[in-house]
Interface confidence: low
């Protein structure tokens, strides 16, 4: 199931923007239709797994399905990071990883996914119905967050497929630029089509808009982007809420972490020009699963010359699902 953020409400364009080119007017709706089919919103998935060998150990895996560069990932539990949740780990693609007990090991799995092992007993131990949330700050999409918890009926050692969690939040301020143009175009197209349907011979007026083609297509919704923002955050069993995690992990990160607020992922950061991009930036994209992936080092056109795709500082665990986390 694909759960996607609702497109922000946009004011419909003024009446009379159909254009003055006779039948050529139909070109614009078709262009916009093409853009709408390829436009949409990113999504975040969360997978929670209880280890068979250690019943107090959880593995949380989160991934970002979008074409932008990730600038920060924040993992929290007890609810969303900005709404009462407690930060477990912060992962920065360039500056490293910091985690707090009971987080045992946080690491990048792939360029767009992370995993975190939690363990412990006592006050800070997770329990089966704890909610875990992952927030991805990315450029240019903005900040996206999803939450998930272990299904009540799950057997230890099993995990649900890493489908997008039914909770997704976007900072609308991050959906600008290309996305804004496309969203406006989609609304405009629907407006045109509706007017065209009701008026077999519309009166044409000079066009006052000229939607520009995006330099990179965003993700396309497979269904109408509706439910996600209407879904409330998952109910949290307060008996499983962890104590405030103010103890830094022994392997504390560099000094830059000290000044990093726990809500740092709330706003996207412009990523630096990360080194060691392993494959030539050819700017070629392959359309898959209703969207685009920047394949194997090819730089998304919208990132600009100074925004190369980053390598994982600990080495990606390359599309290997829940495996291999020791």
């Amino acid at each position: 199931m694909r759960t996607e953020a609702q497109v922000p409400a946009l004011q419909p364009p003024e009446p009379g923007l159909e254009g003055a080119m006779g039948h050529r007017t139909l070109v614009l709706p078709w262009v916009l239709l093409t853009l709408c089919v390829t436009a949409g919103t990113p999504e975040v998935w969360v997978q929670v797994r209880m280890e068979a060998t250690e019943l107090s150990s959880f593995t949380i895996r989160c991934g970002f399905l979008g074409s932008g560069s990730i600038s920060l990932v924040t993992v929290s539990w007890g609810g969303p990071n900005g709404a009462g949740g407690t930060t477990l780990a912060v992962l920065h693609p360039e500056r490293g990883i910091r985690q707090w007990a009971p987080a045992r090991q946080a690491r990048w799995e792939t360029q767009s996914s992370i995993s975190l092992i939690l363990e412990g007993s006592g006050a800070s131990s997770p329990c089966a119905n704890t909610t875990f949330c992952c927030k991805f700050a990315s450029f240019p999409e903005g900040s996206w967050e999803a939450c998930g918890s272990l299904p009540p009926s799950s057997d230890p050692g099993l995990s649900a497929p890493p489908t997008p969690a039914p909770i997704l939040r976007a900072d609308l301020a991050g959906i600008l630029g290309v996305s804004g143009v496309l969203l406006f175009g989609c609304v405009y197209l629907l407006h045109l089509l509706r007017r065209h349907k009701h008026r077999p011979a519309p009166r044409l007026q000079p066009s006052r808009t000229s939607p520009q083609a995006p330099r990179a297509r965003a993700w396309a919704p497979s269904q109408a982007s509706q439910a996600a923002l209407h879904v409330p955050y998952a109910t949290i069993n307060t008996s499983c809420r962890p104590a405030t995690l103010d103890t830094a992990h022994p392997h504390g990160g560099p000094s830059w972490w000290a000044s990093l607020p726990t809500h740092a992922a709330h706003r996207p950061q412009g990523p630096a020009a990360w080194a060691s991009t392993p494959i030539p930036a050819r700017g070629s994209f392959v359309s898959v699963e209703n969207g685009l992936y920047a394949q194997a080092g090819e730089r998304p056109p919208h990132t600009g010359p100074g925004l190369t795709l980053f390598p994982d500082p600990r080495g990606p665990r390359a599309m290997e699902g829940p495996l291999g986390v020791r």
Partner: antibody, heavy 117, light 107 residues
Framework: QVQLKESGPGLVAPSQSLSITCTVS????????IKWVRQPPGKGLEWLGT???????DYNSALKSRLSISKDNSKSQVFLKMTSLQTDDTARYYC???????????WGQGTLVTVSA | DIQMTQTTSSLSASLGDRVTISCRAS??????LNWYQQKPDGTVKLLIY???RLHSGVPSRFSGSGSGTDYSLTISNLEQEDIATYFC?????????FGAGTKLELK
């Protein structure tokens, strides 16, 4: 451009050890995992192990006691060492990179190792 | 270990044909299924990863689908250069395991 090249001894006597080097270019070993895979003649592929960007390793449990994977980031080289070889270890040995989060994204051409007296 | 089964060890087809190669996992692998092409000279290339995502530089005639335990690779318009052996591989659980391969031949 991503390139991987394996170099090995070609022929190894039974009970001896095998050492293969994978030399990479086009990316940094500190950021990406390298996997080792082998293929006996006329048979399928078998994953041997992985060394990650941070130096941690995963091994195929069936071979773990005989395998060791290490690397030298500065030389862009990854090393596979396998001990106590037997004739059924005869295979083409490949290294493959996990470039940008894609499993076995790029492969070397492989090096054929024959275990024979 | 998760067993990957490619029931068809060899397949004959004509140029231009639509060819489908199947792969079954012994348990749910959550879409962590990748397809590789091995040419007769031993060269191996990744075609598709995570069930349906096309790797860089792979022609669009290749596509993948499936979920749970059953997956397939489809070549929509077979070309001469596609004559090779195709392997599936699961990346959901260690050890990583491959199917035995399906050899594609010309009729």
């Amino acid at each position: 451009q991503v390139q991987l090249k394996e170099s090995g001894p070609g022929l190894v006597a039974p009970s001896q050890s095998l050492s293969i080097t994978c030399t990479v270019s086009g990316f940094s070993l500190s950021g990406y995992g390298i996997k080792w895979v082998r293929q006996p003649p006329g048979k399928g592929l078998e994953w041997l192990g992985t060394i990650w960007g941070d130096g941690s390793t995963d091994y195929n449990s069936a071979l773990k006691s005989r395998l060791s994977i290490s690397k030298d980031n500065s030389k862009s080289q990854v090393f596979l060492k396998m001990t106590s070889l037997q004739t059924d270890d005869t295979a083409r040995y490949y290294c493959a990179s996990d470039s940008l989060g894609i499993t076995f994204g790029y492969w070397g051409q492989g090096t054929l190792v024959t275990v024979s007296a | 270990d998760i067993q990957m089964t490619q029931t068809t060890s060899s397949l004959s087809a004509s140029l231009g044909d639509r060819v489908t190669i199947s792969c079954r996992a012994s348990q749910d692998i959550s879409n962590y299924l990748n397809w590789y092409q091995q040419k007769p000279d031993g060269t191996v290339k990744l075609l598709i990863y995570y069930t349906s995502r096309l790797h860089s530089g792979v022609p669009s005639r290749f596509s993948g689908s499936g979920s749970g335990t059953d997956y397939s690779l489809t070549i929509s318009n077979l070309e001469q250069e596609d004559i090779a052996t195709y392997f599936c591989q699961q990346g959901n659980t260690l050890p990583l395991t491959f199917g035995a391969g399906t050899k594609l031949e010309l009729k």
